[in-house]
């Protein structure tokens, strides 16, 4: 529209103007995970708080059963941070035993599920070897990027080890998306 | 507005259309900290460059006395990176002495202050154990997410150890926010 | 425009309304790097996939020869993640030999090139010492922030060691930008 007269009727044809406050948005925060059945050959998915504290969903962006449901096609910025914490890593035990150092690792994946596709799509992955010398360790993995999503797509966050996720504070582990 | 005729008068009621270039935005960059008095029982807050180099504030988003001032209610994307650098970690000294490895840590918190609330709200936290073997270490912590903020809210970045913040380059340590 | 009647003719003067779907956007994903000539005294630049899989460019945002080309002046959110992987770090070898621990490091820089400027501008830097005890290590560096860019500016991602970049999956190493 640069340098072009304001012409709503013409503009409507190819891309309707949108009030920004009307766009689908969500910020979900960590809750303590309960043992559940996970899909085979797939990292377990986290479930989330969607309405208490800092968490919210708005403008038809809904959270249900570990998934964020995309209500409208478009380009979304999607982000997540997962803070992991552990007590010693096997790596240090292996090291002491004089065997080769196969590092432990922590991984976060943001996954898209499209009902018409048989396989989920991995949108973002953060993976890190953990070979800590200290007995207690903790660290975050942050991810964020823009993706073209379709109405009905579902988003989830999978982690390599659900028992290491720090669930203690809503500002440490979170997941969000918003339509650009 | 999907599939709906363009109707500004109707739209105005619940969410006015906005020119994007008119939205509150800020990107602040690191400066070397000077020893100052900090609030008790709270990590010290960083102060920032707000107009030189890559730094800017615009559209009524103001920076004053370590705070970004939110001029308008709405959903904001807020982000920060802090690069820390240290020489040895106490962890390694403790290790040499044969005592248990309580790791050092580095922490960044993005905090919201609302005058009508007695307590600040921690929006985002990145925290990492540091138990480095090398004598010199450096690493960033990155945070970013979307929050619903109110006009008059104030944002700041707090760190666990202000002396370890790398102040040498504006691209290493920064803080920003923009209205979505 | 808060609390003000919707007045398109007035608004048009200082900032035209924009259909969001019409804004320049790109998300690029990793490809295996081929040995090329790099600029002297500058970290090598990565080249990217721009149309297959999750990658796309749209609305006049073009990718050419390692650069994202900015088609329109404005404030952009720019992000990248680079996942590095290595086999032992010199640091651990040096340590075993009893010499001082000069850490290895991994660095990612998002750089802006403006034809009228002789020197590139470093917008974002993530740098991390790597002094791993394990023999195999891997880890991501994530960056993201907002910058005011001019039409014709070019963006690239430079890394300290191109041979350590994990090129195996499009979700591990990526680069993107979008007009706000």
């Amino acid at each position: 529209l640069k340098g072009q007269e304001f012409a709503p009727s013409h503009q409507q044809v190819y891309a309707p103007l949108r009030a920004d406050g009307d766009k689908p948005r969500a910020h979900l925060t960590v809750v303590r995970q309960t043992p559940t059945q996970h899909f085979k050959n797939q990292f377990p998915a986290l479930h989330w708080e969607h309405e208490l504290g800092l968490a919210f969903t708005k403008n038809r962006m809904n959270y249900t059963n570990k998934f964020l449901l995309i209500p409208e096609s478009g380009d979304y910025f999607i982000y997540s941070q997962v803070t992991f914490r552990g007590m010693t890593s096997e790596c240090s035990e292996i090291r002491q035993a004089g065997r080769p150092n196969k590092p432990d690792s922590i991984t976060v994946v943001i996954t898209k599920v499209t009902d018409s596709y048989p396989e989920p799509t991995q949108l973002l992955m953060g993976t890190k070897s953990v070979c800590e010398v200290g007995s207690n360790w903790f660290q975050p993995i942050y991810l964020g990027a823009m993706f073209s999503l379709q109405e009905g797509d579902k988003l989830m966050v999978n982690v390599s080890d659900i028992s290491l996720v720090d669930y203690t504070k809503e500002d440490k582990t979170f997941f969000g998306a918003f339509l650009l | 507005l999907k599939g709906q005729e363009f109707a500004p008068s109707h739209q105005q009621v619940y969410a006015p259309l906005r020119a994007d270039g008119d939205k509150p935005r800020a990107h602040l960059t690191v400066v070397r900290q000077t020893p100052t008095q900090h609030f008790k029982n709270q990590f010290p807050a960083l102060h920032w460059e707000h107009e030189l180099g890559l730094a800017f504030t615009k559209n009524r988003m103001n920076y004053t006395n370590k705070f970004l001032l939110i001029p308008e209610s709405g959903d904001y994307f807020i982000y920060s990176q802090v690069t820390f650098r240290g020489m040895t970690s106490e962890c390694s000294e403790i290790r040499q002495a044969g005592r248990p490895n309580k790791p050092d840590s580095i922490t960044v918190v993005i905090t919201k202050v609302t005058d009508s609330y007695p307590e600040p709200t921690q929006l985002l936290m990145g925290t990492k154990s540091v138990c480095e073997v090398g004598s010199n270490w450096f690493q960033p912590i990155y945070l970013g997410a979307m929050f619903s903020l109110q006009e008059g809210d104030k944002l700041m970045v707090n760190v666990s150890d202000i002396s370890l913040v790398d102040y040498t380059k504006e691209d290493k340590t920064f803080f920003g926010a923009f209205l979505l | 425009l808060k609390g003000q009647e919707f007045a398109p003719s007035h608004q048009q003067v200082y900032a035209p309304l924009r259909a969001d779907g019409d804004k320049p956007r790109a998300h690029l994903t990793v490809v295996r790097q081929t040995p090329t000539q790099h600029f002297k005294n500058q970290f090598p630049a990565l080249h990217w996939e721009h149309e297959l899989g999750l990658a796309f460019t749209k609305n006049r945002m073009n990718y050419t020869n390692k650069f994202l080309l900015i088609p329109e002046s404005g404030d952009y959110f720019i992000y990248s993640q680079v996942t590095f992987r290595g086999m032992t770090s010199e640091c651990s070898e040096i340590r075993q030999a009893g010499r001082p621990n000069k850490p290895d490091s991994i660095t990612v820089v998002i750089t802006k090139v403006t034809d009228s400027y002789p020197e590139p501008t470093q917008l974002l830097m993530g740098t991390k010492s790597v002094c791993e005890v394990g023999s195999n290590w891997f880890q991501p560096i994530y960056l993201g922030a907002m910058f005011s860019l001019q039409e014709g500016d070019k963006l690239m991602v430079n890394v300290s060691d191109i041979s350590l970049v994990d090129y195996t999956k499009e979700d591990k190493t990526f680069f993107g930008a979008f007009l706000l």
């Epitope: - | 070397r32 900290q33 000077t34 020893p35 100052t36 008095q37 900090h38 010290p44 650098r85 240290g86 020489m87 040895t88 106490e90 000294e93 050092d104 004598s135 010199n136 150890d161 202000i162 002396s163 370890l164 913040v165 102040y167 040498t168 380059k169 | -």
Partner: antibody
Framework: EVQLVESGAEVKKPGASVKVSCKAS????????MHWVRQAPGQGLEWMGW????????NYAQKFQGRVTMTRDTSINTAYMELSRLRSDDTAVYYC???????????WGQGTMVTVSS | DIVMTQSPSSLSASVGDRVTITCRAS??????LNWYQQKPGKAPKLLIY???RLQSGVPSRFSGSGSGTDFTLTISSLQPEDFATYYC?????????FGPGTKLEIK
């Protein structure tokens, strides 16, 4: 006003110990590392080590390892540097110094002259 | 340990002169280089940090440059109060080390 105030001059015999104090005011003592730097008469500056007043963690220059002890009392915003087994070449002005980053010293004490003489 | 060297060790100059002092590190110290001014009987005063950044309250006639191993301190127009000893100091790794100093005297 941000300042560091050190204890008074000392005269010690070889083999003895000296403990110098440094009281901080005008800033949050626990948030900034405290360094000790000495300067022999007519000579340059020599860094001895630091203490992190928050954790009590220390980092000493190898040269002083085993002879120097840095401590702090956060209740009175004071850091201490004790040097033992004094020799005549330890005669120097001892400064405490702090700053907004770990690697540079914005604020200095006025210095404490320590004379080691038999 | 990183060894810092300075040149010249002493320098005579007049009010209004432009003066340059150089400092060299025995290995790369990135931009973690600081400059101090010390007058007789006084504690040192921080002038420049991070190789090129002026400490708050220091006159703009002082400037610093360099990166890696080679650094310079420049005083663009000497004032009477600038006659003192100048030290460089590396903050890259411990033990932090100072240069031997450059004594700036009135000609």
């Amino acid at each position: 006003e941000v300042q560091l105030v050190e204890s008074g001059a000392e005269v010690k015999k070889p083999g003895a110990s000296v403990k110098v104090s440094c009281k901080a005011s005008g800033y949050t003592f626990t948030a900034y590392y405290m360094h000790w730097v000495r300067q022999a008469p007519g000579q340059g500056l020599e860094w001895m080590g630091w203490i992190n007043p928050n954790s009590g963690g220390t980092n000493y220059a190898q040269k002083f390892q085993g002879r120097v002890t840095m401590t702090r009392d956060t209740s009175i915003n004071t850091a201490y540097m004790e040097l033992s087994r004094l020799r005549s070449d330890d005669t120097a002005v001892y400064y405490c110094a702090s700053g907004g980053s770990i690697d540079a010293f914005d604020i200095w004490g006025q210095g404490t002259m320590v004379t080691v003489s038999s | 340990d990183i060894v810092m060297t300075q040149s010249p060790s002493s320098l005579s100059a007049s009010v209004g002169d432009r003066v340059t002092i150089t400092c060299r590190a025995s290995q790369s110290i990135s931009s973690y280089l600081n400059w101090y001014q010390q007058k007789p009987g006084k504690a040192p005063k921080l002038l420049i940090y991070g190789a090129s950044r002026l400490q708050s309250g220091v006159p703009s006639r002082f400037s610093g440059s360099g990166s890696g191993t080679d650094f310079t301190l420049t005083i663009s127009s000497l004032q009477p109060e600038d006659f003192a000893t100048y030290y460089c100091q590396q903050g890259f790794s411990t033990p932090f080390t100072f240069g031997p100093g450059t004594k700036l005297e009135i000609k």
